[in-house]
């Protein structure tokens, strides 16, 4: 019957994620009992995405690799609301890599998921970015301006933020 086949589909979908995410936290979306959205435990959720704060100190390339083995990417921030959500889980004395880089050092910033870089939706600290050798972006806290972005050398180890689409079952 319909419910049985739906359950079988859900189980096979869950098996796909089991290698890196042995536990999922799911919530019912809307009123329909058949629509569940899930994030790996202990990731946090906001709108249609899941977020993970990685506390290991890694270069930008390795931070992105670390996210990718979990089925995610370094975070792409699309709105002020999204950034406001993310910063609730960050420590003020730490810096975190974003999925934003300038590989050629020509100030052509690009997001890891190919989302177009929009100058109007950026949250650089004042005076940033300021160095052509600093080709990767972090988010950090400055007492004068709170949370914002800064360019940094990609090899300097930092913490990072991973983002993935919610898993719908």
């Amino acid at each position: 019957n319909f419910m049985y086949s739906k359950t079988v589909k859900r189980l096979s979908k869950l098996r796909e994620y089991q290698q890196y995410h042995p536990s999922l936290t799911c919530v019912m979306e809307g009123k329909d009992i058949e629509d569940w959205s899930c994030c790996p435990t202990p990731w946090t959720s906001f709108q249609s995405s899941c977020y993970f704060i990685s506390t290991g100190m890694q270069s930008w390339t390795k931070s992105q690799k670390n996210c990718s083995v979990m089925g995610a990417d370094l975070v792409v921030i699309n709105t002020r609301e999204e950034q406001d959500f993310i910063i609730q889980n960050l420590k003020r004395n730490s810096s975190y890599f974003l999925g934003l880089s300038d590989p050629g050092g020509r100030r052509h910033w690009q997001w890891v998921d190919q989302t177009p870089y929009n100058e109007n939706v950026t949250f650089w600290h004042s005076g940033e970015p300021n160095n052509l050798d600093e080709r990767c972006a972090i988010i950090n806290f400055r007492s004068s301006e709170e949370w914002g972005w800064n360019d940094i050398h990609c090899h300097v180890p930092q913490k990072s933020i991973c983002k993935m689409k919610k898993i719908y079952i």
């Epitope: 290991g56 890694q58 690799k65 083995v69 160095n131 600093e134 940094i152 050398h153 090899h155 300097v156």
Partner: antibody, heavy 118, light 107 residues
Framework: QVQLVQSGAEVKKPGASVKVSCKAS????????IHWVRQAPGQGLEWMGT????????SYNQKFKGRVTMTRDTSTSTVYMELSSLRSEDTAVYYC???????????WGQGTLVTVSS | DIQMTQSPSSLSASVGDRVTITCRAS??????LAWYQQKPGKAPKLLLY???TLAEGVPSRFSGSGSGTDYTLTISSLQPEDFATYYC?????????FGGGTKVEIK
Amino acid sequence: QVQLVQSGAEVKKPGASVKVSCKASGYTFTSYLIHWVRQAPGQGLEWMGTIYPGGGDTSYNQKFKGRVTMTRDTSTSTVYMELSSLRSEDTAVYYCARMGDNEYFDYWGQGTLVTVSS
Amino acid sequence: DIQMTQSPSSLSASVGDRVTITCRASGNIHNYLAWYQQKPGKAPKLLLYDAETLAEGVPSRFSGSGSGTDYTLTISSLQPEDFATYYCQHFWSTPYTFGGGTKVEIK
């Protein structure tokens, strides 16, 4: 050609501090991270931390946090590693190494022997 | 922190021998591994990086392989100048720890 030239040997008393220098030449000093690695007599290698000469950003091995400070002087293309509260176990050869584009240590200094003895 | 366990700690071999040194990481280091050669009183010299890429100027008798947690350095035909101590080092996340070293001595 790329060269990292370190300061000379030091003898220090327990509790004192030592500051070792590493002068870089043959490349753009501010574009590459410098790491510090030490080696106790007859022992293996131990990573201490790194500094980015362009912005001064540092990352230290937790084992040395609070005792190690890495700084740089861009006018002389020199990086410094200062280790405080020295004890006999800190007797070692201290190396600086450049991290190349491939994110590995491609050039090393000749080493600086620091002896801690009362 | 990721620990690196290198074996053997020492070995005796003759010129022309094939020599294999292994390095095991306590976690997946995704091939971010370097091998160094060190001679007494000298700084380490980079031999291989990314587990299997030969550094500039390094003879082709040196090769590396492995993935995940297990890695190998092979010297296909040992030469007199290869008698030295060899170290592995991971670069996955800080601290970038080294293996304990393998001393290759003349038999």
